[in-house]
């Protein structure tokens, strides 16, 4: 049951983060122009990796894109290819983690197998947390040279007599959304991580637990008719005995190929 | 159609105080911002004041800041100057002005009401 | 503060000439976000209330005939009258609509010879 939760809550958790590391690549506030200490533009200046957007006081707001990739700053790129590399194996690991969930049965699909793809989709996802975080990072770091380079200079000369305004950017919007959301799927990530580890089955045999019966001594173990398989059956956490054995979340099992009492 | 309609104009001492109001009808006033311009007797236009469509930003000249107060109530449809320690210099006529939903351009002009600062 | 300054302070055409009057502005007013110049002309005819002509230093309010047009950009304009018309005759006045505080240039005045 614990196994189950973890692992839907680590996908759950994962889609938040997902939706929020394509939402922040989408969003148009990575930058926001700083009001505080700065001339008072009568129009509110804010850029994303895609386009730069201006509102003005009516309310209207016009965006241009950035209609060339050779012009643009690398570090913006590397922003850019962080953040879609985040949402591409994001998405992957959304699409194998559906699959890899407890509750969802395909056909006869081995419990090994949905272990291996919960523990594939997390280390997708845990990547992917760390794409956007780092991606976000590149950016704010960015920003912050930018603002002390400008804040240095704020009115740039042009040919000793004509001042130009030196609009400062401050954090956006998108930055918090990017941190929040790369959090998010790294946790997701490593939550499906530990659930790989409870969906695992056993390769080796159970510990024995033994039932003394009148005459004779018969040692079972936990699994039923298949505990000498090395695979046991019980994979739905159930009592298979009234008779005290536990189950197999209750008892932990170590290498040891007889371990009759 | 668009109107704006100043009052509260007229004759009065340096150091007085005077409040115009502007009345606007023809479109949703509280969704526009809101400007004061004037202009001396035989000079150039000069801008006042600014105010925002949620009151939010205000903004005044330097040579106002301190002395004029704009507001505005968006019940009432109406824009107003507050204007105290009048000076010779504020003589003007106070034009009450839309900013328009383009370009911060000023659109729609009212035909002014004459402040008139002496002694 | 920004200030604008308009040249010639006044000019005397014909009647179908084209005219060109100039605004410089201490700063620039281009935005590099929507990549427009924060730059308004307006038309002031006597004994009536300023019109608002053009905006984002090019574009025309609606209602203004084509023969008006503006150019330039950061920090040097230009309003251009094709075939000047008697109706024409007004003092024509550029603002700084950038920057607080907004500031107008101190005028053009035209007149017909």
């Known amino acids: 049951m614990a196994v189950t939760a973890c692992q839907g809550l680590g996908f759950v958790v994962s889609l938040i983060g997902i939706a929020g590391i394509i939402a922040a690549t989408c969003m148009d506030q990575w930058s926001t122009q700083d009001l505080y200490n700065n001339p008072v533009t009568a129009v509110f200046n804010y850029q994303g990796l895609w386009r730069s957007c201006v509102r003005e006081s009516s309310g209207f707001t016009e965006c241009r894109g950035y209609f060339t990739l050779l012009g643009l700053p690398a570090m913006l790129q590397a922003v850019r290819a962080l953040m879609i590399v985040g949402i591409v194996l994001g998405a992957i690991g959304l699409l194998v983690s559906i699959f890899a969930l407890k509750c969802i049965r395909i056909g006869s699909m081995e419990d090994s197998a949905k272990a291996n793809m919960t523990l594939t989709s997390g280390i997708m996802f845990i990547v992917s947390g760390l794409c956007a975080i780092a991606g976000v990072s590149v950016f704010a770091n960015m920003l912050v040279t930018n603002f002390w380079m400008s804040t240095a200079n704020m009115y740039t000369g042009m040919g000793g007599m004509v001042q130009t305004v030196q609009t400062r950017y401050t954090f956006g919007a998108a930055l918090f959304v990017g941190w929040v959301a790369g959090g998010l799927t790294l946790i997701g990530g490593v939550m499906m991580c530990i659930a790989c580890r409870g969906l695992a089955p056993e390769e080796t045999n159970y510990k024995a637990v033994s039932y003394h019966a009148s005459g004779h001594s018969v040692a079972y173990k936990p699994g039923g008719f298949k505990a000498s398989t090395g695979f046991g059956s019980n994979t739905k956490n159930k009592k298979i005995y009234d008779g005290g054995a536990r189950t197999e979340d209750e008892v932990q099992s170590y290498p040891s190929k007889h371990d009759y009492v | 159609e668009v109107q704006l309609v100043e009052s509260g104009g007229g004759l009065v001492q340096p150091g007085g105080s005077l409040r115009l109001s502007c009345a606007v009808s023809g479109f949703t006033f509280s969704s526009f911002g809101m400007h004061w311009v004037r202009q001396a007797p035989g000079k150039g236009l000069e801008w006042v004041a600014y105010i925002s469509s949620g009151t939010t930003n205000i903004y005044y000249a330097d040579s106002v800041k301190g002395r004029f107060t704009v507001s505005r109530d968006n019940a009432k449809n109406s824009l107003y100057l507050q204007m105290n320690s009048l000076r010779a210099e504020d003589t003007a006529v106070y034009y009450c002005?839309?900013?328009?939903?383009?370009?911060?351009?000023?659109?729609?002009w009212g035909q002014g009401t004459l402040v008139t600062v002496s002694s | 503060d920004i200030v604008m300054t308009q040249s010639p302070d006044s000019l005397a055409v014909s009647l179908g000439e084209r005219v060109t009057m100039n605004c410089k502005s201490s700063?620039?007013?281009?935005?590099?976000?929507?990549?427009?110049?924060?730059l308004t002309w307006y038309q002031q005819k006597p004994g009536q209330p300023p019109k608002l002509l053009i905006y984002w230093a090019s574009t025309r309010e609606s209602g203004v005939p084509d023969r008006f047009s503006g150019s330039g950009s950061g920090t040097d304009f230009t309003l251009t009258i094709s075939s000047v018309q008697a109706e024409d005759v007004a003092v024509y006045y550029c603002?700084?609509?950038?920057?607080?505080?907004?500031?107008f240039g101190q005028g053009t005045k035209l007149e017909i010879k």
């Open positions: 603002q700084n609509v950038y920057i607080y505080p907004l500031t």
């Open positions: 002005v839309r900013s328009g939903y383009y370009g911060q351009s000023l659109d729609y």
């Open positions: 700063q620039s007013l281009f935005s590099s976000g929507n990549q427009r110049n924060y």
